[in-house]
């Protein structure tokens, strides 16, 4: 139901959603200090502006007695209590930031009027595309399915000269938060992806892969996974693997690829790495001395949130227009904002856009080297490497179907 | 509102390192983007690179193996330093605050010549 | 890299007369452009923001239009300070890029 406001006469007020359940399990205390990083940076602007206001978030903590999974099992109810919890106490900001797991958003999406607007750092499934107030800072499902629509299909580069049409897929429940909404958009058969492949099957069981790996009967030479190297090690070990095999690893939030002195194991020669394009070194800034490289972009994009809002807020009273409005509630898309580590676009639907890189494993030099990059706001791919030193014939990607020929 | 001021030496030889500092008042370096952008006599505006709040850069490809952009909190400074040198670096420098170049410097005007 | 082809060079007008110069962007960039006003010897000022924004302390003469490829600043009525030399700049696309500029004369 609604709620009044705080954010009005001069005094805006960011609801900060501090749920025990996460996309990813970062101490709370880490979020904290990149939400006052980005207050600290929003009052500055404002002030230079000459907006004489007030800023501060509101930390919503719920109880961690009912909920206390730490994963997004139980988020749903967790989302719509902190929601009671905020309504009871009329204690609602301008925006809401959080929650981040996909159960929780689509929940408190549906219940809610929502005329503010809401930014989730996560919330990576499917059920969240489209949500007219809900903006989304972290990559979301659909805009993985694009990118591998876009390169299955491509087939003009030195690379790759055939277009692929059939893929398996690994997901045996165990992923994390953003790796089960990727597989789940994947597996979904009505996605986009489904729709445009000929053949799909998903595999659930590790031997299930491993079986697959010498396969000759098998009917794709494409798996696609998602995790890091060491989860790829633990199901598929030193096993022999077909000559034309090709496995497509997402783990999009792990800039440890990109590190000088990281060199690939013999077991990710015949991976190809889709993660997102590291951009800056955030590892001298205060806010991220306590993060882990992945965690990194899940504070990133908290802080991004407060950013976000303080670049619209500006814009409004600049314009001298109410901030309680459906207006402002939609007006959080369709724009490039000043990001803590560089400019960040949404799209028109309000999801992140980025830069996404396609890794390969240098059989000459062992590093992990980016074969082609592809930006998910003009769906276009960009080759880099037009000479690999692939493991598999030719330094050519395969055909996805053993035996077929030039398409 | 945001003061800006180029400083730097007006003539530099070719192969040595162009230095200069932006010394900012009326608001902290640290609730912006800052940028470099330069104008050769007669010619267009081009950009340098940006250094973002978080203090990690992006620099125009054409000039990215010569150029560093840096910060100085505690004196509320930004720097560009460009090595190598030629005269074809000859150009009035401007810094500039915001991804939008909100705020400019009146510029300084660096020669390059023996 | 996005190319923004800015037009006329150089245009000369009288006091008074409404000047309209146009920039388009080699491809779509929503409304993430400004122009900006150079004199030599100052510091430059942007103008309009946003597209059609107008700078805080920026006479009302002047206006923006536009928004994707195609783009208009427009002095509705031109008073002698406004000799200057004019500028768009994109930032909508790393890396932000400008136009060529276009010199602005009083007869």
């Known amino acids: 139901s609604q709620v009044s406001q705080n954010c009005h006469n001069g005094s805006y007020e960011i609801s900060v959603l501090m749920m025990g359940n996460s996309a990813f399990a970062e101490p709370l205390k880490n979020l904290e200090d990149a939400v006052n990083e980005g207050l600290e940076i929003v009052r500055g602007r404002l002030q230079n502006a000459g907006l004489n206001v007030t800023v501060n978030a509101t930390f919503m903590y719920s109880d961690g007695l009912i909920h206390n999974s730490g994963d997004c099992r139980s988020s749903t109810c967790e989302g719509l209590d902190l929601l009671r919890k905020i309504s009871n106490a009329q204690r609602m900001g301008c925006v809401l930031i959080g929650p981040s797991c996909t159960y929780s958003t689509f929940q408190m999406y549906l219940d809610t009027e929502l005329s503010y607007p809401m930014i989730s750092a996560g919330s990576f499934g499917l059920s969240c595309d489209y949500k007219e107030t809900l903006t989304r800072l972290m990559s979301p499902a659909r805009k993985l399915m694009y990118f591998l629509v876009n390169f299955w299909k491509t087939n003009d580069l030195p690379f790759k000269t055939y277009s692929w049409s059939t893929s398996y897929v690994y997901k045996n429940g165990t992923e994390t938060e953003d790796c089960f909404w990727y597989l789940n958009a994947l597996e979904a058969s009505v996605s986009y992806f489904s729709h445009e492949l000929g053949f799909k099957v998903v595999l659930r069981q590790d031997k299930e892969f491993q079986d697959i790996l010498m396969d000759h009967n098998r009917k794709s030479n494409v798996i696609i996974m998602c995790g890091g190297p060491e989860f790829l090690y633990k199901l598929k070990g030193d096993r022999a693997v077909a000559e034309d095999i090709v496995i497509i690893l997402v783990d999009l939030f792990n800039d440890q690829y990109f590190e000088d002195n990281v060199t690939a194991p013999d077991y990710m020669k015949n991976v190809l790495v889709l993660t997102l394009s590291p951009g800056n070194s955030l590892l001298n800034s205060s806010f991220s001395r306590n993060l882990s490289p992945t965690k990194r972009d899940f504070a990133l994009a908290y802080l991004n949130g407060i950013l976000l809002f303080g670049h619209m807020l500006k814009i409004f009273l600049e314009n001298g227009e109410n901030i309680t409005t459906p207006k402002f509630a939609h007006a959080f898309r369709n724009l490039t904002f000043e990001g803590y580590d560089g400019p960040v676009t949404l799209d028109d639907w309000g999801d992140v856009d980025s830069t996404m890189v396609l890794l390969y494993t240098s059989v000459d030099t062992k590093k992990y080297k980016v074969l082609l990059t592809y930006d998910t706001h003009v769906n276009k791919t960009y080759p880099v490497d037009m000479s690999p030193t692939f493991t598999w014939k030719n330094s050519k990607l395969p055909n996805d179907i053993t035996g077929r020929g030039p398409q | 509102q945001v003061q800006l001021q180029e400083s730097g030496p007006g003539l530099v030889k070719p192969s040595e390192t162009l230095s200069l500092t932006c010394t900012v008042s009326?608001?902290?370096?640290?609730?912006?983007?800052w940028s470099w952008i330069r104008q050769p006599p007669g010619k267009g505006l081009e950009w340098i690179g940006y250094?973002?709040?978080?203090?990690?850069?992006n620099y125009n490809l054409s000039l990215k193996s010569r150029v560093t952009i840096s910060r100085d909190t505690s004196k509320n400074q930004v720097s560009l330093k460009l090595s190598s040198v030629t005269a074809a670096d000859t150009a009035v420098y401007y810094c500039?605050?915001?991804?939008?170049?909100?705020?400019w410097g009146q510029g300084t005007l660096v020669t390059v010549s023996s | 890299d996005i190319q923004m082809t800015q037009s006329p060079s150089s245009l000369s007008a009288s006091i008074g007369d409404r000047v309209t110069i146009t920039c388009r962007a080699s491809?779509?960039?929503?409304?993430?452009l400004g122009w900006y006003q150079l004199k030599p010897g100052k510091a430059p000022k942007r103008l309009i923001y946003?597209?059609?924004s107008l700078q805080s302390g920026v006479p009302s003469r002047f206006s923006g239009s536009g928004s994707g490829t195609e783009f208009t600043l427009t002095i509705s009525s031109l008073q002698p300070e406004d000799s200057a030399t004019y500028y768009c700049?994109?930032?909508?696309?790393?890396?932000?890029?400008f136009g060529q500029g276009t010199k602005v004369e009083i007869k």
């Open positions: 500039a605050a915001g991804m939008g170049f909100d705020y």
């Open positions: 946003s597209a059609s």
């Open positions: 250094i973002y709040y978080s203090g990690s850069t």
């Open positions: 700049l994109q930032h909508n696309s790393f890396p932000p890029t």
């Open positions: 009326g608001g902290s370096i640290r609730h912006y983007y």
């Open positions: 491809q779509a960039i929503r409304n993430d």
